[in-house]
Amino acid sequence: TIPPHVQKSVNNDMIVTDNNGAVKFPQLCKFCDVRFSTCDNQKSCMSNCSITSICEKPQEVCVAVWRKNDENITLETVCHDPKLPYHDFILEDAASPKCIMKEKKKPGETFFMCSCSSDECNDNIIFSEEYNTSNPDLLLVIFQ
């Protein structure tokens, strides 16, 4: 719990507490912004990002964005608040412990994005269908 000597601030989005006053530790995420990538046609890739950052706000989660156009492939790794859109998309999978890439419609490029909420989870980005929970067989396994 937060001790009395730690002053409360009126508008404090740097600290998140639950009903019991427990403090939410911030996420640790890979945070290299946009870098060129060699990740292509693979079931999963490592980010090759050497920077693990403490997310600024405790509610932020890890995000990875993979983009391919006629010229290059890039991988973006950041922290982001799931209440806010990123690249105009909602982070619908923010509670996932793994970063499962989902394709998004973007004109002129192939665009995949994932979000997740375990430490450094955007270091390993997963494209493989076997992790996709829209697969009925996998759902059957999960709920058995």
Partner: nanobody, 124 residues
Framework: EVQLLESGGGLVQPGGSLRLSCAAS???????RMWWVRQAPGKGLEWVS?????????YYANSVRGRFTISRDNSKNTLYLQMNSLRAEDTAVYYC?????????????????WGQGTLVTVSS
């Protein structure tokens, strides 16, 4: 009961350096990820840096990366924060805290014990 006691704060000019210490007693220090957290006047808590108990892997907020260095001496149950190239915006009360063990992705651990904090003022 665990007790954390910070020291090393003070008044320093912009560009100067300080080294904070946090002495832990009454606990198995080596079991915990340790944090430095700061609170500027009228602002919220900012998570500055963290260090793992084994292997001593370190993490930093983007605002302090390259200027601050966290370290720990498990034999002395002490956590350190070396702060270089200090700026006015680094002015804050600095707390150390320990992160209780648990599942890595749970993310809702308690900051179960805090130090009383040490004030760092960066001003010319």
């Amino acid at each position: 009961e665990v007790q954390l006691l910070e020291s090393g704060g003070g008044l320093v000019q912009p560009g100067g350096s300080l080294r904070l210490s946090c002495a832990a007693s009454g606990s198995t220090f080596t079991e915990y990820r340790m944090w430095w957290v700061r609170q500027a006047p009228g602002k919220g808590l900012e998570w500055v840096s963290a260090i793992e108990p084994i292997g001593h892997r370190t993490y930093y907020a983007n605002s302090v990366r390259g200027r601050f260095t966290i370290s720990r001496d498990n034999s002395k149950n002490t956590l350190y924060l070396q702060m270089n190239s200090l700026r006015a915006e680094d002015t804050a009360v600095y707390y150390c805290a320990k992160q209780a063990p648990g599942e890595k992705w749970a993310r809702r651990w308690d900051l179960d014990y805090w130090g009383q904090g040490t004030l760092v003022t960066v001003s010319s």
